[in-house]
Interface confidence: medium
């Protein structure tokens, strides 16, 4: 693997920058001399620089004052490509009177601990020891960008080196890129693309359906205003820097349209007056469904062909159609809408309601007491039921017995061929209230008006019947 070389700086030097070859990074001090106390910063010539100097105390001999300690200046800025290796160092000459000197590496204010390739070498001489701390990174990444310094503790004093700036360069990296959108036809919208280096600048080109949109690049970030589309398009952006170009993922911009019609309209449950349906929504036309409309037509040559419309929410994809006639055939279709408009109606399906319960009560209900048999005779006339109520299957008789604050109801079922019934007397000295309802497969119809008869104590007979008048006889 090649060793990365620091390149000349682009705009101008950063603080402490030197355009140096790597050879100088690794060179050892040739003399055992000390760094002078007064130094000049490479960035501000002529200004005294004393930032990283430590003033040692008097030696054990008590006579000789040692010069200040400081790291030797090294390269200030290293620029290299991603995945290259880099090595840099700090060097300092320390009088031999100091023991246990350790150098630590710091990056952007945090100490670098653990699995880093840091090596410290010692080169002792008669009076001083030259210490070189090397730091190497293999296959650098953008995350290695930053300011590296050496720190050394000596006599409770901290000596800090000048920073070495590492700038890792690579292809542009997207921080913001266009996102898929659903837009209204011929309506303007914006797409945003942002990418960063280093190296900067990063220039943006926009591509629509594989063709360049802008002939001149725009500096990142870039906002593309599209005046409007009439058909779906794919947009991507290209980010260019001096290392190459990166192409973003292509994003599809869809044109909102009316939805496709729902499909698979299904019947889940039918009663005499309601039908529960469900449907599978069609394609939403790139715009959320707002609501749906259930359209119901009665399939009957005699009907006037009018359409009942029931509006419902788009979700769940289910609706209970109510207020229907019993034992009737209907044609049902569903349409849904989004912000653009209504879909066509789904394929129509046929559905039927079931038999209804009778809508009228039996007529001319009469009740009289047959004391010899200790029962009550009940008679009635078959009601005039409509076809939709279905076939009569029988009658339901309700008789309520009330005596001295006690009340109990009993129900009897009789067949459809009957128009009379007998019930046993349950309680004497009591009132019996009778009501009758017709029954079909569709259910139980309304009960007739109540007819009351008094059941006397044993031996007191009144044969007079009680009855409900037939309509029109009152």
């Amino acid at each position: 693997r090649e060793e990365a070389k620091p390149y000349p700086l682009f705009p101008g030097p950063l603080p402490g920058s030197l355009q140096t070859d790597h050879t100088s990074l690794l060179s050892l001090p040739h003399t055992s001399g000390y760094q002078p106390a007064l130094m000049f910063s490479p960035t501000q010539p002529g200004r005294p620089y004393t930032g990283n100097v430590a003033i040692p105390r008097v030696t054990s001999a008590g006579s000789k004052l040692l010069p200040p300690l400081a790291f030797k200046h090294t390269v200030g800025h290293i620029i290299l490509s991603e995945h290259k290796d880099v090595k840099f160092n700090c060097s300092i000459s320390v009088p031999n009177i100091y023991q246990d000197t350790t150098i630590s590496w710091w990056k952007d204010g945090k100490e670098l601990l653990g699995a880093h390739h840091a090596i410290t070498q010692f080169y002792p001489d008669d009076e001083v020891t030259a210490i070189i701390a090397s730091f190497s990174i293999t296959s650098v990444q953008r995350s290695d960008n930053g300011s590296y310094i050496c720190k050394m503790k000596i006599n409770n004093e901290e000596i800090v080196s000048d920073p070495i700036y590492i700038e890792v360069q690579g292809l542009p990296h997207f921080t913001k890129q266009p996102e898929s959108m659903n837009v209204t036809r011929n309506t303007a919208f914006n797409l945003t693309c942002q990418a960063v280096g280093p190296p900067e600048p990063v220039n943006i080109f926009w591509v629509q359906n594989s063709s360049r949109v802008n002939e001149q690049p725009e500096k990142s970030p870039s906002v593309l205003t599209v005046p409007g589309l009439t058909e779906m398009a794919v947009f991507s952006c290209e980010a260019h820097n001096d290392k190459g170009l990166t192409v973003s993922k292509g994003v599809q911009i869809n044109i909102k349209a009316i939805p496709s019609p729902p499909t698979e309209v299904s019947i889940h449950n039918s009663t005499a007056h309601s039908i529960l349906i469900s449907w599978v929504p069609g394609f939403d036309g790139y715009s959320p469904f707002r609501n749906c409309s259930v359209q119901v037509k009665e399939v009957d040559p005699l009907s006037n062909g009018s359409v009942m419309i029931f509006n419902t929410s788009a979700s769940p994809h289910m609706y209970q159609i109510k207020q229907l006639q019993a034992l009737a055939n209907y044609s049902i279709g569903v349409s849904c809408m989004n912000e653009i408009g209504w879909s066509a109606v789904s394929p129509w399906i046929l559905a039927s309601t079931t038999e209804g319960a009778p809508s009228v009560a039996p007529l001319n209900v009469t009740v009289f007491l047959n004391e010899s048999r200790d029962n009550v005779d009940i008679r009635w006339m078959k009601p005039l039921t409509k076809r939709q109520a279905g076939e009569l299957v029988g009658y339901r008789i309700s008789h309520v017995w009330q005596s001295a604050g006690i009340s109990k109801e009993l129900l009897e079922e009789v067949g459809q061929n009957n128009s009379r019934a007998q019930i046993s007397v349950q309680v004497h000295n009591a009132t019996c209230t009778v009501r009758i309802a017709a029954v079909t497969k569709g259910g139980v119809g309304p009960f007739s008006d109540p007819v009351k008869i008094f059941i006397p104590a044993h031996g007191w007979v009144d044969h007079a019947p009680s009855s409900t008048p037939a309509p029109g006889n009152a």
Epitope: K5, Y7, S81, E82, H83, Q141, R142, G170, L171, H173, F174, F205, V207, S210, S211, R212, E238, H240, D242, K243, G244, L245, T246, V247, S248, K249
Partner: antibody, heavy 128, light 111 residues
Framework: QELVESGGGLVQAGESLKLSCKAS????????ISWVRQAPGKGLEWIAY????????NYAHSVKGRFTISSDNAQNTVFLQMPSLTASDTATYFC??????????????????????WGPGTLVTVSS | DPVLTQTPSSVEAAVGGTVTIKCQAS??????LAWYQQKPGQPPKLLIY???TLASGVSSRFKGSGSGTEFTLTISDLECADAATYYC?????????????FGGGTEVVVK
């Protein structure tokens, strides 16, 4: 990692050829592949580019609308379809791969401007 | 569209010497420039990219410099194996509308 071209040969003017560039030891979809030609005793001329994993294609003005670059990602092969050849198309045709860029994110195309890996070339001779 | 002009078209130098090849772009290409070496019967070999970055496995005797419109390839401590034709190359445009451009080449003869 290597690229090997094939499909060259001697053809008459007006005939067609289809060149192949087979890549091995390369994550085929993560690189751009170009065709570069060199007429006998002349310099290098880039003619077409494809980024197989992204469907990006690109042509030099001299061949745009005439040559077609394509790829078979399953076979790790790039093709150059050359119909209606003329004597000026006589050259050694090289395929070349973009410079390594392993710092990428899946789903993006990275074009690094330079060619780091070349095939040995295949000679196309068009006689008039 | 940028045009790359290489000078000289041919240069002769002795073993151990230094050769300098220039590449001039007709418009600024920043540092988007590569140098290739091609020996007869062989494909080109990438030497330098991004104007000054040494490609992997290439001797440090090859040095690239320059930016904008003026670029230089310097070969020091010339060896017999350096006898070849050298091409500069750039790229301009986008992913679907970009072009690679080569210079006309410089032949290096080593005595």
């Amino acid at each position: 990692q290597e690229l090997v071209e094939s499909g060259g040969g001697l053809v008459q003017a007006g005939e067609s050829l289809k060149l192949s560039c087979k890549a091995s030891g390369i994550d085929f979809s993560s690189y751009g592949i170009s065709w570069v030609r060199q007429a006998p005793g002349k310099g290098l001329e880039w003619i077409a580019y494809i980024y197989p994993g992204f469907g990006i294609t690109n042509y030099a003005h001299s061949v745009k609308g005439r040559f077609t670059i394509s790829s078979d990602n399953a076979q790790n092969t790039v093709f150059l379809q050359m119909p209606s050849l003329t004597a000026s198309d006589t050259a050694t045709y090289f395929c070349a791969r973009d410079l390594d860029y392993t710092g990428g994110v899946v789903g993006y195309a990275y074009v690094t401007y330079y060619f780091t890996l070349w095939g040995p070339g295949t000679l196309v001779t068009v006689s008039s | 569209d940028p045009v790359l002009t290489q000078t000289p078209s041919s240069v002769e130098a002795a073993v151990g010497g230094t050769v300098t090849i220039k590449c001039q772009a007709s418009e600024s290409i920043s540092s988007r420039l590569a140098w290739y070496q091609q020996k007869p019967g062989q494909p080109p070999k990438l030497l330098i990219y991004s104007a000054s970055t040494l490609a992997s496995g290439v001797s440090s005797r090859f040095k690239g410099s320059g930016s904008g419109t003026e670029f230089t390839l310097t070969i020091s401590d010339l060896e017999c194996a350096d006898a070849a034709t050298y091409y500069c190359q750039t790229y301009y445009g986008g992913s679907t509308t970009g072009w690679y451009v080569f210079g006309g080449g410089t032949e290096v003869v080593v005595k």
